[in-house]
C-alpha cells in the first residue's frame, strides 16, 4: 500500500481521483475551500468537494449500490430462472409422452376408432398444456369434452359398426347419452378428480416458481431513496473530500448504514422465508394423484379400461341409446 | 387388456419399465431445488451484512472511516458518529417499502396463502375415496406403485413414477463435475422414459 | 488472499515508452475494475487510469490522455499500462489497485518505480 501522501494544500490528489467518476476538473476546487454550500460531506475545515461533486459521488454510490444488490441475488436468480424453465420443459414433454401413450393405445388396441381419436386425444393434450401454463380452462370440461367426443365414435365404430360414421344428428344425441347414461361408469370422474388435482398442482408450483424470479427481478432493479444515497455516499466518498483516498468504512458502520438503506427490502424476509417452507409443503405433496407425471403417463389406460367398460355393458347401452336415440337414427336412414 | 402404448413414440423404441432407482425423477428434481432454495431462506434479512461484506470494509487496518473522520478500528466512535448529523436512521427505517416492494410482498402473500390451501391434506381426495365408488375395472391398489396399463394378465406395473426425460438434457451451462449426473444404464427389458437433466446449481 | 504484484517499472528517456504489468491473485479479476494510481516523490497520490472488469471501458487522467492506453488479460489475470511520449513528471512509484466500487479503492499492489530522466 502507499506511503500516506502528505497534506494537500492544492486539491491535486482530490482533483485527479474525481477525474475517475467525472472526466475534466471544472467541478473541482483549486484549493481548500470552506464548503458551506454542502450537504453530505459536511466538513469539520476547509474541504476539497463542491456541491456538484457530492451531486456526482451520491449518483455514483447509489448505481454502487444497485450493482452490489444484484451480483448479491444472481446465484438465487439463476437457481430459479434455471428451475422454471427446465420444469416447464420437463412438463410439456410429459404431456407430449401421455399423448403418445395414449394415441398409441388406441392404435394397438382399437384401429378403428383411430384417427377421430387421435383428434380428440390431440385436443385435450392441448388444453392440459395450456391449463399448466395458467390458461383460463376448466379440467371437467376438458374430461367431458374428451368423453363426449369419444363416444360417439365408439359407439359408431366399436358397438354399432352398421351405422355410417357422418352420423351428425345422432352424434349430438349420444353425446347427451354418455353423460346421462354413464356410459363410462365412473372412470370419467376418476379422469377428473386425478387430472384436476395434479394440474393444479403443476400450475401452482410453476407459477410460485416465476413469480420467485419477479421478486429477485423487483429487489434486483430497485432505486435507492436520496436518503440512502447520502448514507452512501458520506460512507464511500466523503473521505475523499479530505485527501484520504486510501481508508475504508468501519464495519459496524457499514452495517448500520446497509440497515437503513434495505429496511424495506429486508420487510420481504418474513414472506420470502414462508414462501420457501409453503413451496417445500406442495413439494412434499406432490406425489400419487398429486404428481402430473404420475397421473398422465397412466391416463392410457385408464382411458382404455374406461372403453372396456362401455364394450362390457355394450349389450344393455345398444338398447337403451337405441330407443333414446331412436328418433335421429330414423331421420337419418331416410 | 391394453397393449403397453410401444408405437408412436418420439424414438420409436418399445417402451419398457424403468426400474432403476438411481435416475433422476421429476419428484426428486423438485426436492433438490427445495434444498436448495431452503439455503437462500435468509437471504433478505442477510442482504445488510452480505453487502457489507462484499463491499470495501476495513479489517485489517488499525484505522477506518466513520463518515466525519478516521477513527482507531475498535473505537466506539468507529460506528457511531458517522450517524451524527447526517439525518435521522430511525425516520428512514419508518417510511417504510417503496410501492414496488408492497405489491411484491402482496403477490408473494398470495402465492403463500395459495401453496398453502393447495398442501392442506383436508381438502385432498385420496385415491382409496375413489374406490368407494364402485368401479367395475380400472382399479388400483392403495400401495406405492401405479398401475400402468389396463387390468388383467397385461397390466404392467411401473414402480412410482417413470424416470427423467431423456430429450431434456439439453445443455445448461452447469457443472460437469464428475459424480454430477447419474444417468442410469437401462438393463434387459428396460427403458429409461426419463434421463437425467444435468443438475441445475 | 487478494495480491496484486506490479512489475516493468524502470529508468527511461524522455520520449520513451515502458509496459507496466500488474498480475493479480485470490480473486475473480474479471468481475472487477482495475485502476493505475501514482505518487511523484513527495507529493500526493494520483489517478491515472481506470478500465471496467470486461475491458470494454476505460477511463484517463487528463495529464496522460492520449499517451497511455490501460488493458487486460482475464485469461492471465494481468493489468497492463502502455506508456508511450514519457515525460520527466511522469515520474512516480506507480500502483495498480481493485476497485472495489467505481472509484473506491480496496486493495493495492506494493508498486513500481518509473523514472523518466535524460
Known amino acids: 500500500q502507499p506511503p500516506p501522501p502528505p497534506p494537500d494544500a492544492t486539491c491535486h490528489q482530490v482533483r485527479s481521483f474525481f477525474q475517475r467518476l467525472q472526466p475534466g476538473l471544472k467541478w473541482v476546487p483549486e484549493t481548500p475551500v470552506p464548503g458551506s454550500d454542502l450537504q453530505v460531506c459536511l466538513p469539520k475545515g476547509p474541504t476539497c468537494c463542491s456541491r456538484k461533486m457530492e451531486e456526482k459521488y451520491q449518483l455514483t454510490a447509489r448505481l454502487n449500490m444497485e450493482q452490489l444488490l444484484q451480483s448479491a441475488s444472481m446465484e438465487l436468480k439463476f437457481l430459479i430462472i434455471q428451475n422454471a424453465a427446465v420444469f416447464q420443459e420437463a412438463f410439456e414433454i410429459v404431456v407430449r409422452h401421455a399423448k403418445n401413450y395414449t394415441n398409441a393405445m388406441f392404435k394397438n388396441n382399437y384401429p378403428s376408432l383411430t384417427p377421430q381419436a387421435f383428434e380428440f386425444v390431440g385436443e385435450f393434450f392441448t388444453d392440459v398444456s395450456l391449463y399448466i401454463l395458467g390458461s383460463d380452462i376448466n379440467v371437467d370440461d376438458m374430461v367431458n369434452e374428451l368423453f363426449d367426443s369419444l363416444f360417439p365414435v365408439i359407439y359408431t365404430q366399436l358397438m354399432n359398426p352398421g351405422l355410417p360414421d357422418s352420423a351428425l344428428d345422432i352424434n349430438e344425441c349420444l353425446r347427451g347419452a354418455r353423460r346421462d347414461l354413464k356410459v363410462f361408469g365412473n372412470f370419467p370422474k376418476l379422469i377428473m378428480t386425478q387430472v384436476s388435482k395434479s394440474l393444479q398442482v403443476t400450475r401452482i408450483f410453476l407459477q410460485a416458481l416465476n413469480l420467485g424470479i419477479e421478486v429477485i427481478n423487483t429487489t434486483d432493479h430497485l432505486k435507492f431513496s436520496k436518503d440512502c444515497g447520502r448514507m452512501l455516499t458520506r460512507m464511500w466518498y466523503c473521505s475523499y473530500c479530505q485527501g484520504l483516498m486510501m481508508v475504508k468504512p468501519c464495519g459496524g458502520y457499514c452495517n448500520v448504514v446497509m440497515q437503513g438503506c434495505m429496511a424495506g427490502v429486508v420487510e420481504i424476509d418474513k414472506y420470502w422465508r414462508e414462501y420457501i417452507l409453503s413451496l417445500e409443503e406442495l413439494v412434499n405433496g406432490m406425489y400419487r394423484i398429486y404428481d402430473m407425471e404420475n397421473v398422465l403417463l397412466g391416463l392410457f389406460s385408464t382411458i382404455h379400461d374406461s372403453i372396456q367398460y362401455v364394450q362390457k355393458n355394450a349389450g344393455k347401452l345398444t338398447t337403451t341409446i337405441g330407443k333414446l336415440c331412436a328418433h335421429s337414427q330414423q331421420r337419418q336412414y331416410r | 387388456s391394453a397393449y403397453y402404448p410401444e408405437d408412436l413414440f418420439i424414438d420409436k423404441k418399445v417402451l419398457k419399465v424403468a426400474h432403476v432407482e438411481h435416475e433422476e425423477t421429476l419428484s426428486s428434481r423438485r426436492r433438490e431445488l427445495i434444498q436448495k432454495l431452503k439455503s437462500f431462506i435468509s437471504f433478505y434479512s442477510a442482504l445488510p451484512g452480505y453487502i457489507c461484506s462484499h463491499s470495501p470494509v476495513a479489517e485489517n487496518d488499525t484505522l477506518c472511516w466513520n463518515g466525519q473522520e478516521l477513527v482507531e478500528r475498535y473505537s466506539q466512535k468507529a460506528a457511531r458518529n458517522g450517524m451524527k448529523n447526517q439525518f435521522n436512521l430511525h425516520e428512514l427505517k419508518m417510511k417504510g417499502p417503496e410501492p414496488v416492494v408492497s405489491q411484491i410482498i402482496d403477490k408473494l402473500k398470495h402465492i403463500n396463502q395459495l401453496l398453502r390451501t393447495m398442501s392442506m391434506p383436508k381438502g385432498r381426495v385420496l385415491d382409496k375415496n375413489l374406490d368407494e365408488e364402485g368401479f367395475e375395472s380400472g382399479d388400483c391398489g392403495d400401495d406405492e406403485d401405479e398401475c400402468i396399463g389396463g387390468s388383467g394378465d397385461g397390466m404392467i406395473k411401473v414402480k412410482n413414477q417413470l424416470r427423467f426425460l431423456a430429450e431434456l438434457a439439453y445443455d445448461l451451462d452447469v457443472d460437469d463435475a464428475p459424480g454430477n449426473s447419474q444417468q442410469a444404464t437401462p438393463k434387459d427389458n428396460e427403458i429409461s422414459t426419463f434421463h437425467n437433466l444435468g443438475n441445475v446449481h | 488472499q487478494v495480491q496484486l504484484v506490479e512489475s516493468g517499472g524502470g529508468l527511461v528517456q524522455p520520449g520513451g515508452s515502458l509496459r507496466l504489468s500488474c498480475a493479480a491473485s485470490?480473486?475473480?479479476?474479471?468481475?472487477?475494475?482495475m485502476s493505475w494510481v501514482r505518487q511523484a516523490p513527495g507529493k500526493g497520490l494520483e489517478w491515472v487510469s481506470a478500465?471496467?472488469?470486461?475491458?470494454?471501458?476505460?477511463y484517463y487522467a487528463d495529464s496522460v490522455k492520449g499517451r497511455f492506453t490501460i488493458s487486460r488479460d482475464n485469461s492471465k489475470n494481468t493489468l497492463y499500462l502502455q506508456m508511450n511520449s514519457l515525460r520527466a513528471e511522469d515520474t512516480a512509484v506507480y500502483y495498480c489497485?481493485?476497485?472495489?466500487?467505481?472509484?473506491?479503492?480496496?486493495?493495492w499492489g506494493q508498486g513500481t518505480t518509473v523514472t523518466v530522466s535524460s
Open positions: 489497485a481493485k476497485e472495489a466500487l467505481t472509484g473506491v479503492f480496496d486493495y
Open positions: 485470490g480473486f475473480t479479476f474479471s468481475s472487477y475494475a
Open positions: 478500465i471496467s472488469g470486461s475491458g470494454g471501458s476505460t
